[in-house]
Interface confidence: medium
């Protein structure tokens, strides 16, 4: 099998930050805050940011929010929603983060780095 194309610094940083969050939870992440689930498809970085930006006062995801800001090509503010949100489904931030992490890992396996 061919070797993987090295991921961009931002994506590598995002994956490693998501790993850090999922692996080092000592208490419910963001006090068990709920966020809108998203469709993990094109535009997911902006959609993920739109969900997570509505979580306030949770230092554990500040860095993730900052990295997603860099990966999303347009400005995102709290209360903003795109069609990528599954608006009838809310999940805990911890599950959201892990789902995003596993999806990114799958994309890397398949060679889709953007």
């Amino acid at each position: 099998s061919p070797g993987p194309v090295p991921p961009s610094t931002a994506l590598r940083e995002l994956i490693e930050e998501l790993v850090n969050i999922t692996q080092n939870q000592k208490a419910p992440l963001c006090n068990g805050s709920m966020v809108w689930s998203i469709n993990l498809t094109a535009g997911m970085y902006c959609a993920a940011l739109e969900s997570l930006i509505n979580v306030s006062g949770c230092s554990a995801i500040y860095r993730t929010q900052r990295i997603l800001h860099g990966l999303c090509p347009h400005k995102v503010s709290a209360g903003q929603f795109s069609s990528l949100h599954v608006r009838d489904t809310k999940i805990e931030v911890a599950q959201f983060v892990k789902d995003l992490l596993l999806h990114l890992k799958k994309l890397f396996r398949e060679g889709q780095f953007n």
Partner: antibody
């Protein structure tokens, strides 16, 4: 096709040393972390050590730390395990395993060698 | 250090469903991989990333992970599924790979 071929096992006396090798082929060796996992006769799998693709980061089980050294030569597509101060409890089949992803903390092992037997006995 | 607990043995009749559990503190926050090992052979990855299957592994093998338990489910069990099964995670607090103690699946 991914292939991992271990060698270097054998009989060694307690306190002795042994160097295991794992020749890899069928993938871009330097892009993946590698690991050694052992299995004592009739027992379960026990992780021994791992190394990042570049070789810059190494990890060891507490039971072997300070006695075993993992290394790799990416120009030769080969993984090594230098085992010193061997004990009877190190007797096991030693497997070389390829990690499934570049980020070390997501490690699963998608390919394994057939193993090499290390017997520590006087 | 992080501990993964598996039942030593699980027995199931052919054609039935086998469920092998792997318990760990908040294991749902971790990424779990499962291996099958037959006597005298090297382990084989059968489920990775909690629930994904490598190519070549039958759809009968599936995984789930939440709370304090990860589960490997083998539906329509066949005699050839008889083997030892191990769960595995990465423990970031110790920078160690951790394996469960293994479960021997017996097909009656």
């Amino acid at each position: 096709e991914v292939q991992l071929l271990e060698s270097g096992g054998g009989l060694v006396q307690p306190g002795g040393s042994l160097r295991l090798s794992c020749a890899a082929s069928g993938f871009t060796f330097s892009s993946y972390a590698m690991s050694w996992v052992r299995q004592a006769p009739g027992k379960g799998l026990e992780w021994v050590s791992a190394i990042s693709g570049s070789g810059g980061s190494t990890y060891y089980a507490d039971s072997v730390k300070g006695r075993f050294t993992i290394s790799r030569d990416n120009s030769k597509n080969t993984l090594y395990l230098q085992m010193n101060s061997l004990r009877a409890e190190d007797t096991a089949v030693y497997y070389c395993a390829k990690a499934d992803f570049w980020s070390g903390t997501l490690w699963g092992f998608d390919y394994w060698g057939q193993g090499t037997l290390v017997t520590v006995s006087s | 250090s992080y501990v993964l607990t598996q039942p030593p043995s699980v027995s199931v009749a052919p054609g039935q469903t086998a469920r092998i559990t792997c318990g760990g503190n908040n294991i749902g926050n971790k990424i779990v991989h499962w291996y099958q090992q037959k006597p005298g052979q090297a382990p084989v990855l059968v489920v990775y990333d909690d629930s994904d299957r490598p190519s070549g592994i039958p759809e009968r093998f599936s995984g789930s992970n939440s709370g304090n338990t990860a589960t490997l489910t083998i539906s329509r069990v066949e005699a050839g599924d008889e083997a030892d099964y191990y769960c595995q995670v990465w423990d970031s607090s110790s920078d160690h790979v951790v394996f469960g103690g293994g479960t021997k699946l017996t097909v009656l």
